[in-house]
């Protein structure tokens, strides 16, 4: 805590500018008006303040807004955002996507910090659901964001938001998460034709039941092996050799190389040897 000291004569800051970098911490505390700082927050980022000086500026804003900063200030926090604690952020009411983007930009290239996680949580809760524009923004900054949510949180994602999801956004999702997302994706893409539908649904198929895989096998989709191996084992096991052959198309040839990995291994063991022989791969059941 900086002590309350009077501002030396002629040092009162008429505006936020570069001259303030030469102020000692106590001078900043005494000579910068908090209301002025709040209205000129956009200038702070352009000035190379030290971390200690930023601490003082944060302190001034905290005193001015003990119940939490208004969005007009939050939007222009810039690097000062990195000084905020999750407790500070919980007091905020962020409703603008532009504000969210501005703050995510500050943390860009870094792991999701507790501050960012709290900010996102506050924002999404304020909106009531994870809409398409929000999801678009969040996955652009954090491709793993979707997979960091619990199945319960994912259940609030409307099917319309699924259009914003890219394949890489699902890379770290586990089967429980895909179980929630797959029906939403199926609904979102239901009006697309066969090949276009498969391109979109492919990355969600880790949540698909057997009957949907059987249906896909009738559509000449040529599923690649990496996708096949992400399918639920319990969904793959009931598939016949003919169905797997149709599902994978030319990629069925790769089963030989992956015969020791699940779900390939478990599936092979369920098949009749005569049927496996038709694959032309020398697989042993």
């Amino acid at each position: 805590e900086v002590e309350k000291t009077a501002c030396p004569s002629g040092k009162k800051a008429p505006e936020i500018d570069e001259s303030l970098i030469f102020y000692k911490k106590w001078e900043l505390e005494a000579c910068v008006d908090a209301a002025l700082l709040a209205t000129q927050m956009d200038r702070v980022n352009a000035i190379p303040f030290t971390y200690e000086q930023l601490d003082v500026l944060k302190h001034k804003l905290d005193e001015l807004y003990p119940q939490g900063y208004p969005e007009s200030v939050i939007q222009h926090l810039g690097y000062l955002f990195l000084k905020m604690s999750p407790e500070d952020i919980r007091k905020w009411n962020v409703t603008s996507l532009e504000t969210l983007k501005a703050l995510l930009e500050v943390n860009k290239g870094h792991e999701m910090s507790p501050q960012v996680a709290t900010l996102i949580d506050r924002f999404v809760k304020g909106r009531g659901q994870l809409d398409k524009d929000t999801l678009d923004t969040l996955t652009a900054f954090y491709p793993g964001y979707l997979c960091s949510l619990s199945p319960e949180e994912l259940s609030s994602v409307p099917p319309s938001s699924i259009w914003a999801v890219r394949p890489q956004d699902l890379d770290t999702c586990d089967p429980r998460q895909l179980d929630v997302l797959y029906p939403k994706a199926r609904l979102a893409f239901q009006n697309m034709n066969g090949s276009e539908y498969f391109v979109k649904i492919q990355s969600f198929l880790g949540g698909a039941p057997t009957e949907d895989l059987k249906a896909l096998s009738q559509q000449n989709v040529s599923m690649d092996l990496a996708t096949f191996m992400k399918l639920r084992t319990d969904a793959v096991l009931p598939l016949t050799v003919a169905e797997v052959q149709k599902l994978l198309g030319p990629h069925v040839e790769g089963l030989k190389a992956e015969e020791r990995h699940r779900p390939v291994r478990d599936w092979i063991l369920r098949q009749r040897q005569d049927d496996l022989d038709t694959l032309g791969l020398g697989l042993q059941g």
Partner: antibody, heavy 115, light 113 residues
Framework: QVQLQQPGTELVTPGASVKLSCKAS????????MHWVKQRPGQGLEWIGN????????FYNEKFKNKATLTVDKSSSTAYMQLSSLTSEDSAVYYC????????WGQGTTLTVSS | DIVMTQSPSSLAVSVGQKVTMSCKSS????????????LAWYQQKPGQSPKLLVY???TKDSGVPDRFIGSGSGTDFTLTINSVQAEDLADYFC?????????FGGGTKLEIK
């Protein structure tokens, strides 16, 4: 040892068709798919398609769908590729190669399309 | 289609030198379930057919000398030849077998000074 035998050269006229052969030995013919690859002089390699010798299923690179037809004769352990409506663009070396990893290749057939 | 880009297109080295060549794919070739990269390297000596050197990005085929080392994952791959020998004069191609159509890189021509 594994061998894939291909005739050395084929000379055909434009507009004609040709059937290239690839005789496999030294392994179980129906346990590996057969692939065909095109290489034009001084250029890279292009995958044409593959065939499952066990049931005759074929898959083609879209680019060669109307050009190549793959077949096998299990009794002689031979894979075939028929190329139709030949033009000078089809002049190239054509290789057969075994399996998903293409771990064994034939010596290649040099196809020359010329009048 | 997955585009495979090799560099350099040619290089000349002296016997005993170490050489590295690069292969980049336009999309990831990693099967995260098995942690295998579906990428192979082939060597084609003048007047001969291609020969498999390395598969799954880093597994040497049987009979391939220890001086050949494949590495990389995802979209960036490298073939290194430690202590190049005169018989290594050849074109080297990478190829993805992640999805059809299976595609090859344009090749790197290795010349011996």
């Amino acid at each position: 040892q594994v061998q894939l035998q291909q005739p050395g050269t084929e000379l055909v006229t434009p507009g004609a068709s040709v059937k290239l052969s690839c005789k496999a030995s030294g392994y179980s013919f129906t346990s590996y798919w057969m692939h065909w690859v095109k290489q034009r002089p001084g250029q890279g390699l292009e995958w044409i398609g593959n065939i499952n010798p066990s049931n005759g299923d074929t898959f083609y690179n879209e680019k060669f769908k109307n050009k190549a037809t793959l077949t096998v004769d299990k009794s002689s352990s031979t894979a075939y590729m028929q190329l139709s409506s030949l033009t000078s663009e089809d002049s190239a070396v054509y290789y057969c190669a075994r399996g998903w990893l293409r771990d064994y290749w034939g010596q290649g057939t040099t196809l020359t399309v010329s009048s | 289609d997955i585009v495979m880009t090799q560099s350099p297109s040619s290089l000349a080295v002296s016997v005993g030198q170490k050489v590295t060549m690069s292969c980049k794919s336009s999309q990831s070739l990693l099967n995260s379930s098995s942690q295998k990269n579906y990428l192979a390297w082939y060597q084609q000596k003048p007047g001969q057919s291609p020969k498999l050197l390395v598969y799954f990005a880093s597994t040497k085929d049987s009979g391939v000398p220890d001086r050949f080392i494949g590495s990389g994952s995802g979209t960036d791959f490298t073939l290194t030849i430690n202590s190049v020998q005169a018989e290594d004069l050849a074109d080297y191609f990478c190829q993805q077998h992640y999805t059809t159509p299976y595609t090859f890189g344009g090749g790197t021509k290795l010349e011996i000074k």
